[in-house]
């Protein structure tokens, strides 16, 4: 019998330096394109190999981006969020929410990380 699946949610501040093709990740979400039901937040859909985010190593696919340079990403249209990233400057501070899946099974079963949330 499988155990209950819980999520450990943590927040982190990540500072990235823009590379030749941006910050090195793709986003989904927004008020006009909800990626998660009843949540119009902005999520990381892909980390580009050798891009700024991949080289930093902390941002993960499935992370929710809460703010960019202190600007809240709540209730934004998808394109407005994209424009924020495009115009964020050379040094960019991201506040992100990681969601780690942990399975509470029988004793002896280890938790499993699922960065895609």
């Amino acid at each position: 019998m499988n155990g209950r699946v819980d999520y450990l949610v943590t927040e982190e501040e990540i500072n990235l330096t823009r590379g030749p093709s941006g910050l090195g990740f793709n986003i989904v979400g927004g008020t006009d394109q909800q990626y998660v039901s009843n949540d119009s937040g902005i999520y990381v859909s892909r980390i580009k190999e050798n891009g700024a985010a991949a080289l930093d190593g902390r941002l993960q696919e499935g992370d929710k981006i809460l703010s960019v340079n202190g600007q809240d990403l709540k209730n934004l249209l998808h394109q407005d969020a994209v424009d924020l990233f495009r115009n964020a400057g050379y040094a960019v501070s991201l506040r992100v929410q990681h969601r780690l899946q942990v399975q509470n099974g029988p004793i002896g079963h280890r938790g499993e990380g699922d960065p895609s949330g």
């Epitope: 030749p20 941006g22 793709n26 006009d32 394109q33 859909s45 892909r46 580009k48 998808h78 994209v82």
Partner: nanobody, 125 residues
Framework: EVQLVESGGGLVQPGGSLRLSCAAS????????IGWFRQAPGKEREGVSC???????YYADSVKGRFTISRDNVKNTLYLQMNSLKPEDTALYYC????????????????????WGQGTQVTVS
């Protein structure tokens, strides 16, 4: 350096077919939401078809059922198969990529993309 180079345009009769190619260099194509755009003389640029990194596709109503977008990740090339061409498809066709958006509809409707090719001319006459 990020570069997109289109090819495959030409003169074709109504009802004919063409296959456009967009070769990418300086980046890995499947890391980007990317699409095909066109601009006819005196008209605004429009998004024709776009594809997300996960393969979701969008087509403008005017080309649905006639055009097919695809991507070859080994060749790092984007394609647009154009069938049943009409005179109103005459335009300069560009490919363009977004560094951030992974929403194919938004990419095709955006006027603020990050990498553009020079275009290839398609004339249906």
């Amino acid at each position: 350096e990020v570069q997109l180079v289109e090819s495959g345009g030409g003169l074709v009769q109504p009802g004919g077919s063409l296959r456009l190619s967009c070769a990418a260099s300086g980046f890995t194509l499947d890391d980007y939401a990317i699409g095909w755009f066109r601009q006819a003389p005196g008209k605004e640029r429009e998004g024709v078809s776009c594809i997300s990194t996960h393969g979701s596709t969008y087509y403008a109503d005017s080309v649905k059922g006639r055009f097919t977008i695809s991507r070859d990740n080994v060749k790092n090339t984007l394609y647009l198969q154009m069938n049943s061409l009409k005179p109103e498809d005459t335009a300069l066709y560009y490919c363009a990529a977004s560094y951030y958006s992974d929403y194919e509809v938004a990419v095709c409707r955006s006027d603020a993309l990050d990498a553009w090719g020079q275009g290839t001319q398609v004339t249906v006459s």
